[in-house]
Interface confidence: low
C-alpha cells in the first residue's frame, strides 16, 4: 500500500457472488502499473448481504434494492471517492438462479433486471448481471486458486505448498460445493477429454491448459438434502420420516409444497397423502452414506469412466483445492487438517451424527439451528460426493487440500470471473494480448 | 490489529533440540504463509523455510533441510520451528514473520519480536 | 541460490543529507525485492516491497527503484531516526536470501 500522504496509484473491482443460499459482495484491489503481472490482485473486503439469494425474491422484487443496500455502502466507504466511476461492478449468479430460469426465463429475467437497475444506481462502473454457466462457475474457481497460488508464473512461489524438489507448476484441481451445484476442475494427465462439454482450453502466461470441468446441477448441499428427501418420503409408510442424517432427538416439520418446488426433487415427486411430514432424526451415518448415495446413478456410463449420472471423469490428477462448502462444512466439523485421514473422517462422522441433538445444541449454543441441524447430512453428503462420486480414496484423500484463503484471498470463482473480465490475464508471458471473454467459455 | 507473538528465550545443550512458537493473535492466520528468519549476533538475516498454516506443507532453505522442521495449529493460530542437533554456531535470535504480499510481490509485512536461543555446553 | 549483495556495508550521511543504498542480486529477481530498517534489539521493519512500492505508514523520503539486478533504495532527507541498519531481500527464489546489509551511520 501507498504512503497515505501521496495518492495510491491502484484500481479496485467488485463481484457480487449471487448464490443459491446467499449473495456475498467481493472488493478487490491491484497496482495500476502491474496489471498484467501474475498474482498482484488481491481481496480487501468480504460482505455477506442479509438475507437468502435472489432467487427467493421471485415474488417482492421490490425489495431487492434494500437487500443490497448494506453491502453497496460497504464498498462505498471502502473504495476511496476518486476511484469510484472508474470501478467495474460485476454480479454473477449461479445454480438458484439456473434452477429459476429452468422453471421460468421471464421470473428469471425479471429478478437480474431489478438487481440491474438497483445496482446502477450506484457510483460504480456497473458491468451488467448475468447468470454464470456452470462450466464457467468451474472453470473461474480453477483460475482463482491457480492464480492465488502463482502456478501461472514461470518464478517459483516461495509459500508453495508443494516442496520444491517437485514440479512447482503443475495446477490444482478445484472442488467447489454450493447450496445447488457442485463443479469439478482438473487437467487430467495425458488423458483425452471424451466429452467436449467437459473440455476447456485455456492459453495463459504463455502456457496451454487442457482442463476438465463439470457442474453438477442439483448436487449443491442444500438441494442434496431436498433430493434426498424427496426420495425417501416416497417409501415412508406415513408423515414421519425417520431420517439417518439429522441427529438423534432431532424433530422438523417439512411442507410436502416446499418439497416439490424445486426442479431438483422432479423426478421424485409423486402424489403424497398428506400436506406436512415430520423429519425425525436417527443419526446413523452408515445409513445417512447409503440414502445419499443413493442420488448417485453409477450403472450408466457411455465413456471410458463417469463420476455419475452419465457424466464423463477422467481419471483424478494431482492436489485439489476444496472450497466454499467443502471449506465451511469442514472447519466446522474440525476435520480441515491436513493430518486427518479419510478414515478418521468417517469415524469423527460416524460420532457427531451419533450425538443427541440436545447435546448438540449445548455444545454449540451460538449456531442458527437451522444450519447446525444440517451439519450431518453436509459433512456425510461431501464424502460420499469425493469418495463415490468423484472417486477419491483413502490414498488420495491427502491430495485434497480444504481451503478458505489463500493469502487473504477467498477461493472461488468471483476472482477469477474479475481478473477475465478486467483482462487481467495476458495470454502470453510476459505481457501481450489478454485473453478475450470467449477464449475459454 | 495483528500481533505475532512469541516464546521466551531458551538455553540450550549442543546436540539438543528447541523449538520456537509464534502466535497470531487478532487477525487471521490460516490464509498467509508464515516464515522464519534468524539472525546470529552481530549478523545479518538469514531466511529458514516457510509455512501457509492452510495447507501445513512448508518449505526449507537447502542449509537446514533435515535439521528443522516447521509446522503450524489452526485452531490456535500458531507456527512453530523447531530445529535439532543444535551447535553453537545456531546461537541467535529467530523471527517468525508474516508474508503479506499480494501473490506476485511478498514481503514481510509483520514480524514477532524474536526469540533469542543460547546454545552453550 | 541468489546471493544479494548491499553496498556500501557502511554509510556515514549528516542528517538532512540524501543516503543511496545500493543491492545487488546475483541473477534476475524481477521487481520481487524488498527492503527492510533494522534498528538495534529490534525486529526488522518493511520499508519498500515490489521494489519501489512503499508500505503503509512509510514516510515519503523513503523511496525504492530498480529492477532485474541493480536495485537502489533513496533517503531524501535523513532524520535522526533513520540511523540503523538496512536489508534488501530477494524474494523470487528458494530460498529467499538477504543482503548483507548496509549500516547507515551518523557523520
Known amino acids: 500500500t501507498q504512503n497515505k500522504a501521496l495518492p495510491e496509484n491502484v484500481k479496485y473491482g467488485i463481484v457480487l457472488d449471487a448464490g443459491s443460499s446467499h449473495t456475498s459482495l467481493y472488493i478487490y484491489k491491484w497496482p495500476a502499473e502491474k496489471e498484467n503481472d501474475t498474482g498482484v490482485v488481491h481481496q480487501v473486503e468480504e460482505c455477506r448481504v442479509k438475507g437468502p439469494g435472489i432467487s427467493k425474491f421471485v415474488q417482492k422484487v421490490n425489495e431487492i434494492g434494500i437487500y443490497l443496500t448494506d453491502c453497496m455502502e460497504r464498498a462505498r466507504e471502502v473504495i476511496p471517492r476518486s476511484q469510484h466511476q472508474e470501478t467495474p461492478v460485476y454480479l454473477g449468479a449461479t445454480a438458484g438462479m439456473r434452477l429459476l430460469r429452468m422453471e421460468s426465463e421471464e421470473l428469471a429475467d425479471r429478478v437480474l433486471d431489478v438487481v440491474e437497475r438497483s445496482l446502477s444506481n450506484y457510483p460504480f462502473d456497473f458491468q451488467g448481471a448475468r447468470i454464470i454457466t456452470g462450466q464457467e462457475e468451474g472453470a473461474y474457481g480453477w483460475i482463482t486458486i491457480n492464480y492465488l497460488l502463482g502456478k501461472f508464473s514461470q518464478k517459483t512461489r516461495w509459500f508453495s505448498i508443494v516442496p520444491y524438489e517437485t514440479n512447482n507448476q503443475e495446477t490444482f484441481g478445484a472442488l467447489d460445493l454450493g447450496g445447488a451445484s457442485t463443479q469439478v476442475t482438473f487437467v487430467p494427465q495425458n488423458q483425452t477429454i471424451e466429452s467436449p462439454d467437459n473440455a476447456l482450453q485455456f492459453r495463459l502466461y504463455g502456457k496451454d491448459y487442457n482442463v476438465y470441468t463439470h457442474s453438477f446441477l442439483c448436487y449443491g448441499k442444500d438441494q442434496a438434502l431436498w433430493q434426498k428427501l424427496a426420495k425417501d418420503i416416497q417409501v415412508a409408510s406415513n408423515e414421519i420420516l425417520r431420517d439417518p442424517c439429522f441427529h438423534p432427538g432431532y424433530k422438523k416439520v417439512v411442507n410436502v409444497s416446499d418439497l416439490y418446488k424445486t426442479p431438483c426433487t422432479k423426478r421424485f415427486e409423486m402424489t403424497l397423502p398428506f400436506q406436512q411430514f415430520e423429519i425425525q432424526g436417527i443419526g446413523n451415518y452408515q445409513q445417512c452414506h447409503q440414502s445419499i448415495l443413493e442420488l448417485f446413478n453409477t450403472s450408466y456410463c457411455p465413456y471410458s469412466q463417469c463420476a455419475f449420472n452419465g457424466i464423463f471423469l477422467p481419471p483424478l490428477q494431482g492436489d485439489f483445492g476444496a472450497f466454499s462448502a467443502f471449506y465451511f462444512v469442514m472447519k466446522f466439523l474440525n476435520l480441515t487438517s491436513e493430518k486427518v485421514s479419510q478414515e478418521k473422517v468417517t469415524e469423527m462422522m460416524k460420532k457427531f451424527c451419533a450425538q443427541p441433538w440436545e447435546e448438540i445444541k449445548t455444545s454449540y449454543a451460538g449456531v442458527k439451528e437451522k444450519y447446525l441441524s444440517e451439519y450431518c447430512f453436509s459433512g456425510t453428503y461431501i464424502l460420499s460426493l469425493l469418495l463415490q462420486g468423484y472417486h477419491f480414496t483413502a490414498d488420495s484423500w491427502e491430495h485434497i487440500h480444504f481451503i478458505g484463503k489463500i493469502q487473504g484471498s477467498d477461493a472461488g470463482w468471483t476472482l477469477g470471473y474479475m481478473l477475465n473480465l478486467t483482462n487481467m490475464i495476458p495470454a502470453e508471458q510476459p505481457l501481450s494480448t489478454p485473453l478475450s471473454h470467449s477464449t475459454y467459455v | 490489529q495483528v500481533q505475532l507473538v512469541q516464546s521466551g528465550a531458551e538455553v540450550k545443550k549442543p546436540g539438543s533440540s528447541v523449538k520456537v512458537s509464534c502466535k497470531a493473535s487478532?487477525?487471521?492466520?490460516?490464509?498467509?504463509?508464515i516464515g522464519w528468519v534468524r539472525q546470529a549476533p552481530g549478523q545479518g538475516l538469514e531466511w529458514m523455510g516457510g509455512i501457509i498454516p492452510t495447507f501445513g506443507t512448508a518449505n526449507y532453505a537447502q542449509k537446514f533441510q533435515g535439521r528443522v522442521t516447521i509446522t503450524a495449529d489452526e485452531s490456535t493460530s500458531t507456527a512453530y520451528m523447531e530445529l535439532s542437533s543444535l551447535r553453537s554456531e545456531d546461537t541467535a535470535v529467530y523471527y517468525c514473520?508474516?508474508?503479506?504480499?499480494?501473490?506476485?510481490?511478498?514481503?514481510?509485512?509483520?514480524w514477532g519480536r524474536g526469540t533469542l536461543v543460547t546454545v552453550s555446553s | 541460490e541468489i546471493v544479494m549483495t548491499q553496498s556500501p556495508a557502511t554509510l556515514s550521511v549528516s542528517p538532512g543529507e540524501r543516503a543511496t543504498l545500493s543491492c545487488r542480486a546475483s541473477q534476475s529477481v524481477g521487481s520481487n525485492l524488498a527492503w527492510y530498517q533494522q534498528k538495534p534489539g529490534q525486529a526488522p521493519r518493511l520499508l519498500i516491497y515490489g521494489a519501489s512500492t512503499r508500505a503503509t505508514g512509510i514516510p515519503a523520503r523513503f523511496s525504492g527503484s530498480g529492477s532485474g539486478t541493480e536495485f537502489t533504495l533513496t533517503i531524501s532527507s535523513l532524520q535522526s531516526e533513520d540511523f540503523a541498519v538496512y536489508y534488501c531481500q530477494q524474494l523470487t527464489k528458494w530460498p529467499l536470501t538477504f543482503g548483507g546489509g548496509t549500516k547507515v551511520e551518523i557523520k
Open positions: 487478532g487477525g487471521a492466520f490460516s490464509s498467509y504463509a
Open positions: 514473520a508474516r508474508d503479506g504480499g499480494g501473490y506476485q510481490h511478498h514481503y514481510f509485512d509483520l
